[in-house]
């Protein structure tokens, strides 16, 4: 009998408010045994896959999707889904990335801390479930 897969979580480092030109990394987490993580955008047709999955804890695996230089087009809602053979999980909640005009250097401390859950996240619309290659530091730039 197939196991019920827990929903993945998504967070952003260093936070969800990123100055223009700075970097951001989306972190997708799921159970151990995940083969593929996919990062999707709300209302966009693009996505990124990675099979570079690391073990974050004895019970959890993760994958990281990095955007080196954030642009205005990167702002929006992101979510994760994973494949643990023989099936895909449900999608995570949406995480909203905000891009602001840079007021300081790329290490300016005014970015919000990353969060993997909480009221700022929009629940994933599961009517979008039909949608169902990066490495640690995967470039996710085409997810505009």
């Amino acid at each position: 009998q197939e196991e019920d897969l827990p929903r993945p979580s998504i967070s952003a480092e260093p936070g969800t408010v990123i100055p223009l030109g700075s970097h951001v990394t989306f972190v997708c987490r799921g159970p151990v045994g995940v083969q593929t993580f996919r990062l999707e955008r709300d209302s966009r047709s693009t996505y990124n896959d990675t099979e570079d999955v690391s073990q974050a804890s004895p019970s959890e695996s993760e994958a990281r999707f990095r955007i080196d230089s954030v642009r205005e087009g990167n702002a929006g809602l992101y979510r994760c889904i994973y494949y643990k053979p023989p099936k895909w999980s449900e999608q995570s909640d949406y995480l909203e990335l905000l891009v602001k005009e840079s007021s300081g250097g790329p290490d300016s401390p005014d970015t919000e801390p990353g969060s993997s859950a909480g009221p700022t996240q929009r629940p994933s619309d599961n009517s979008h479930n039909e949608h169902a290659p990066a490495s640690q530091g995967l470039k996710a730039e085409h997810l505009y």
Epitope: S43, R44, S45, T46, D49, P85, H128, H131, A132
Partner: antibody, heavy 115, light 110 residues
Framework: AVKESGGRLVTPGTPLTLTCTAS????????IQWVRQAPGKGLEYIGA?????YTYYASWAKGRVTISRTSTTVDLKMTSPTTEDTATYFC?????????????WGPGTLVTVSS | ELVLTQTPASVSAAVGGTVTIKCQAS??????FAWYQQKPGQSPKLLIY???NLASGVSSRFKGIRSGTEYTLTISDLECADAATYYC????????????FGGGTEVEIN
Amino acid sequence: AVKESGGRLVTPGTPLTLTCTASGFSLYKYNIQWVRQAPGKGLEYIGASTYAGYTYYASWAKGRVTISRTSTTVDLKMTSPTTEDTATYFCARHIDGDYSGYALWGPGTLVTVSS
Amino acid sequence: ELVLTQTPASVSAAVGGTVTIKCQASQSIGTWFAWYQQKPGQSPKLLIYGASNLASGVSSRFKGIRSGTEYTLTISDLECADAATYYCQCSDVGNTYGAAFGGGTEVEIN
């Protein structure tokens, strides 16, 4: 590659199953759509099997066809074909990184429904 | 239900000329949009995906533009090999927008 099979001459009302076989890639990552083209006509969307295992149909196709998938194939079952279903049937796979475009198409399989 | 209205149904142009094909969507479909070329007896070939991205191996003479719910395919410096039927498609299967093809545009090169 993807390749359709199962097309043949059938009489109206005879169920028919077409199979789209994937090779050279992992089917679990991709949406597969079924499209048909009647002789001398345009492309007509039938439905799709998504990577996550969901199935969707064009409004006209609901109840007339059933789409299912295995780890290497996606089937299109025509429950009770009529002469209007005579067409070449294509399956196609979307491109890496973008769900909107289907770059990998099979050669098509011809279904003829005639009494 | 989503409807894609493609115009014109047919067009004739000279070698070296330019052809413009339009596809009007009945609702906003964002980037869930592609253009295909099909020649007689062949399977469709992807030209443009994501409304404006050139598919791999496709000549840069093909250009896709989105303006609201109107999508345009422009073929410049026409060659004899461009004679074909062109189709637009929205492929947001099962989601907000749905999936459908336009009626097609037959391009003749004279």
